[in-house]
């Protein structure tokens, strides 16, 4: 058992049919003595009486608030919650594993740039009776700063019958370093309760192996005299890293029609213009990403060929 | 060429070959990001190799103070790699394709630097750790930690070198 | 699978024209551009011009501008390429070739020599 | 236009051996490049795709690398079929232009 915050405790059992479960001492937090009884959540069944109750924890039904009372009058409680061990493995019941980049993800991160900010954001099938407390540093050992707002609800989804919720979470790194090369790694730990389920998932990775550049802005089309080609120029995302002679990106320019099967033309540059072939009902299309580390691709930015 | 009196390197000539470094270090390993090597024990690997930190002046405005100290520690980094590369670690059993970029990567890292200290000129270079894996399959983890290693100090020396190419070039 | 099957060997005499086809099979034949590249004898190749069959929109080589013209008949899915005012150095074997991306090419004609001498 | 530049113009390599072809262009290109097979009264067959993506049923000892200018193709160990002329082309700007071409021929 451990204190996760102020009088909320985690019971970890392993979880089999028949488990003998864990013996757990509550201590009433009083100065008194005498006269004190142990209640568990909205029942008035005395469970027992003294300053400690001992307890068998095997199943949900043994967690909850336990509360010690004196004469009518509440002196402290105790929260306990369950974290559940399967054949040696935690659960991971509340959150969804994502698939991407690889089975068993279920936080997934990005940054836009090298300023040590980055979001976090994983998925549930649960609508209530669940909070989520979030704790990042840079390294494990010896561990370097990290600020995490609260995680909130950032999107609803239906998925088949089920509805899906996305949370998500914005860090910072207090001592960030963008032109460094990182030899520790982002740590981000992620606790969530469910009613009395307690598990944790944590994720870890550099700053740069999570860059993902906004898309390029203002695209604008130029036609070229007596030819089909058009140049097309953009400018660097404005969230991208300055200045950009040193943070610098590379640009994928595609000219493609609605679907995805049909011909295109397709030209990649470290330039921010390029002239490519425009079709009529073809949209141009521009994507960016770091010139010098293969991190992911930003969306596109388009704009209609007409 | 940078020299330790402080002459200024041919920056171009950096920038064109610390961006085919980067080129190749993916080559070699482009799957890299796709394996979570940092579970396998990353502590006594990859904590030996230098790594370019904040203090080394490889920021836009420390390169325009005194690039020495940076260019100083990329050139440490760029012969520790290059004696890695060059070690039983990536001779030995299980052998590389024979297609591996890692032979064209083990030479762009010795002539790049050269470009940083002709002959003659001496910067102190940092000890290349006794790593000596006895199993091919520690040697594989091995190979696949250095060159992910490799990418991030090749990406730093890239930005270093296009920086200095496009504001500090005479 | 895609095919391109083009027309057969043609000798012409300089200042002729030539028209070399080629039928594609095997796909929607406006889903693709298409391209003409020639290699004259022992020489390397050289890309001569595209067309979108969709639209009959058209990019030369300059070299080639104004002495080429690349047509297609979506009817019968087949691509021609007319060759004015030949010259001894025009003598190469002309292939077409498809893909639906724009700038290089995947699927190739089995080539037509075309000889020009007097 | 930009002209691309092959080197050696030809490679006398003994089968099993490795090759090693190069493509310089005259500007920076970007990943801009393609590699091409061709084999004698043969149509020319593509091999890489923007300098390093490899082509189904293409055999996996062909691989390419390279951006900016500087361009390489490796067959890691040569077959009997892999004699061939090879070429390089940029698709960076129009007009599209071809190398020279490196004839690969047994030792």
């Known amino acids: 058992i451990w204190e996760l915050k102020k009088d909320v405790y985690v019971v970890e059992l392993d979880w089999y049919p028949d488990a003998p479960g864990e013996m757990v001492v509550l201590t009433c937090d009083t100065p008194e003595e005498d006269g004190i009884t142990w209640t568990l959540d909205q029942s008035s069944e005395v469970l027992g009486s003294g300053k400690t109750l001992t307890i068998q924890v095997k199943e949900f039904g043994d967690a909850g608030q336990y509360t010690c009372h004196k004469g009518g009058e509440v002196l402290s409680h105790s929260l306990l919650l369950l974290h559940k061990k399967e054949d040696g493995i935690w659960s991971t019941d509340i959150l969804k594993d994502q698939k991407e980049p690889k089975n068993k993800t279920f936080l997934r991160c990005e940054a836009k740039n090298y300023s040590g900010r980055f979001t976090c954001w994983w998925l549930t099938t649960i609508s209530t009776d669940l909070t989520f407390s979030v704790k990042s540093s840079r390294g494990s050992s010896d561990p370097q700063g990290v600020t995490c707002g609260a995680a909130t609800l950032s999107a609803e989804r239906v998925r088949g019958d089920n509805k899906e919720y996305e949370y998500s979470v914005e860090c910072q790194e207090d001592s960030a370093c963008p032109a460094a090369e990182e030899s520790l790694p982002i740590e981000v730990m992620v606790d969530a309760v469910h009613k009395l389920k307690y598990e944790n998932y944590t994720s870890s990775f550099f700053i740069r192996d999570i860059i993902k550049p906004d898309p390029p802005k203002n695209l604008q089309l130029k036609p070229l005299k007596n030819s089909r080609q058009v140049e097309v120029s953009w400018e660097y995302p404005d969230t991208w890293s300055t200045p950009h002679s040193y943070f610098s990106l590379t640009f994928c320019v595609q000219v493609q029609g609605k679907s995805k099967r049909e011909k295109k033309d397709r030209v990649f540059t470290d330039k921010t213009s390029a002239t490519v072939i425009c079709r009529k009902n073809a949209s141009i299309s521009v994507r960016a990403q770091d010139r010098y580390y293969s991190s992911s691709w930003s969306e596109w930015a388009s704009v209609p060929c007409s | 060429r940078a020299v330790p009196g402080g002459s200024s390197p041919a920056w171009t000539q950096c920038q064109q070959l610390s961006q085919k470094l980067c080129t190749l270090a993916w080559s070699a390993h482009p799957l890299v990001g796709h394996m979570d090597l940092r579970e396998e024990g990353d502590e006594e690997t990859t904590n030996d190799v230098p790594h370019i930190q904040c203090g080394d002046g490889c920021d836009p405005q420390g390169l325009r103070d005194n690039s020495q100290f940076c260019l100083q520690r990329i050139h440490q980094g760029l012969i520790f790699y290059e004696k890695l590369l060059g070690s039983d670690i990536f001779t030995g059993e299980p052998s590389l394709l024979p297609d591996s970029p890692v032979g064209q990567l083990h030479a762009s890292l010795l002539g790049l630097s050269q470009l940083l200290q002709p002959e003659g000129h001496h910067w102190e270079t940092q000890q290349i750790p006794s790593l000596s894996p006895s199993q091919p399959w520690q040697r594989l983890l091995l190979r696949f930690k250095i060159l992910r290693s490799l990418q991030a100090f090749v990406a730093v020396a890239a930005r270093v070198f296009a920086h200095g190419a496009a504001t500090l070039s005479p | 699978q895609v095919q391109l099957v083009q027309s057969g060997a043609e000798v012409e005499k300089p200042g002729a024209s030539v028209k070399v086809s080629c039928k594609a099979s095997g796909y929607t034949f406006t889903d693709y551009y298409l391209h003409w590249v020639r290699q004259a004898p022992g020489q390397g190749l050289e890309w001569m011009g595209w067309?979108?069959?969709?639209?009959?929109?058209?990019e030369y080589a300059p070299k080639f501008q104004g002495g080429v013209t690349m047509t297609t008949d979506t009817s019968t899915s087949t691509a021609y390429m007319e060759l004015r005012s030949l010259r001894s150095d025009d003598t190469a074997v002309y292939y077409c070739?498809?893909?639906?991306?724009?700038?290089?090419?995947?699927?190739w004609g089995q080539g037509t020599m075309v000889t020009v001498s007097s | 236009e930009i002209v691309m530049t092959q080197s050696p113009a030809t490679l006398s390599v003994s089968p099993g051996e490795r090759a090693t072809l190069s493509c310089r262009a005259s500007?920076?290109?970007?990943?801009?490049l393609h590699w091409y097979q061709q084999k004698p009264g043969q149509a020319p067959r593509l091999l890489i795709y923007?300098?390093?993506q490899s082509i189904s049923g293409i055999p996996a000892r062909f691989s390419g690398s390279g951006s900016g200018t500087e361009f390489t193709l490796t067959i890691s160990s040569l077959q009997s079929e892999d004699f061939a002329v090879y070429y390089c082309q940029q698709s960076n700007s129009f007009p599209l232009t071809f190398g020279g071409g490196t004839k690969v021929e047994i030792k």
């Open positions: 923007f300098a390093s």
């Open positions: 067309i979108d069959p969709e639209n009959g929109d058209t």
């Open positions: 500007q920076s290109i970007s990943i801009n």
């Open positions: 070739n498809a893909n639906k991306e724009l700038r290089y090419f995947d699927v």
